[in-house]
């Protein structure tokens, strides 16, 4: 049983207290109330830099 | 065969208290979230409280939130209902139930009731 | 918390009819709705979960349809099995799932 803190869940899930396990934030645009959403960043991370003249 | 077997029911007077019982067998216990669910005489379901998996997480309706206490015992697969403060309007069938594994999704095993009446 | 709304209320049907029970939230839940059958003096069971999908061992004349706040519970032909009370459950807005007041299926 994993203990909240100690092994972090793989990128793109959140730890869910409710079921005790890894959830995937792909399904909090669906349901945001879910509990793990917290843990869920609001949006990506940019796919590059910008680059500002 | 999945069953969820409710006990610990009965007649209480109004402040009393009751403990209710939910032994769980036919499936690995641990890893499922459960609940309890009510029923008033001739009424329709109403969600009463919901646990984790492990015990870590618990959520209540309003209207027992301080009062009920729900709790399980993983090594005697048994989920449990501490019932304080009892009202006559607690009076129902009590339903354990089986949650899914993924997030409160559905329900798809209950037993088979116990009833609770509150009256003087 | 989200109210979910029945109807109607009860009707009357005889084996072989096509039953359409209909179910209303008071805001959009997705597909997070889930349909169970009662029958007198027993517990619920899951018919329907995520508005469209069979629980296994459930017969094939049960079915779901619906997205958003409308949700539609058919029963293709009535059976003598099928005379019982029929509720809907939402599971969008959690932890405070609700359900539906109940139809109640009578022989005509």
């Known amino acids: 049983e994993r203990v909240p803190g100690t092994t972090p869940c793989p990128r793109g899930s959140s730890w869910s207290a409710d079921l005790d396990k890894c959830m995937d934030c792909a399904s909090c645009r669906a349901r945001p109330h879910s509990d793990f959403c917290l843990g869920c960043t609001a949006a990506p991370p940019a796919p590059f830099r910008l680059l500002w003249p | 065969e999945v069953q969820l077997l409710e006990s610990g029911g009965g007649l209480v007077q109004p402040g009393g208290s009751l403990r209710l019982s939910c032994a769980a067998s036919?499936?690995?216990?641990?890893?499922?979230?459960m609940m309890w669910v009510r029923q008033a005489p001739g009424k329709g379901l109403e969600w009463v409280s919901y646990i984790s998996p492990s015990g870590g997480s618990t959520h209540y309706a309003d209207s027992v939130k301080g009062r009920f206490t729900i709790s399980r015992d993983n090594s005697k697969n048994t989920l449990y209902l501490q019932m304080n403060s009892l009202r006559a309007e607690d009076t129902a069938v009590y339903y354990c139930?089986?949650?899914?594994?993924?997030?409160?999704?559905?329900?798809?095993?209950w037993g088979q009731g116990t009833l609770v009446t509150v009256s003087s | 918390d989200i109210q979910m709304t029945q109807s109607p209320s009860s009707l009357s049907a005889s084996v072989g009819d096509r039953v359409t029970i209909t179910c209303r939230a008071s805001q959009s839940i997705s597909s997070y709705l889930n349909w169970y059958q009662q029958k007198p003096g027993k517990a619920p069971k899951l018919l329907i979960y995520?508005?469209?999908s069979l629980q296994s061992g459930v017969p094939s004349r049960f079915s779901g349809s619906g997205s958003g706040t409308d949700f539609t519970l058919t029963i293709s032909s009535l059976q003598p099995e099928d005379f019982a009370t029929y509720y809907c459950q939402q599971s969008y807005s959690t932890p405070g799932i609700t359900f539906g007041q109940g139809t109640k299926v009578e022989i005509k």
């Open positions: 036919g499936f690995t216990f641990s890893p499922y979230p």
């Open positions: 139930a089986r949650g899914g594994d993924t997030y409160f999704d559905y329900f798809d095993y």
């Open positions: 995520a508005a469209s």
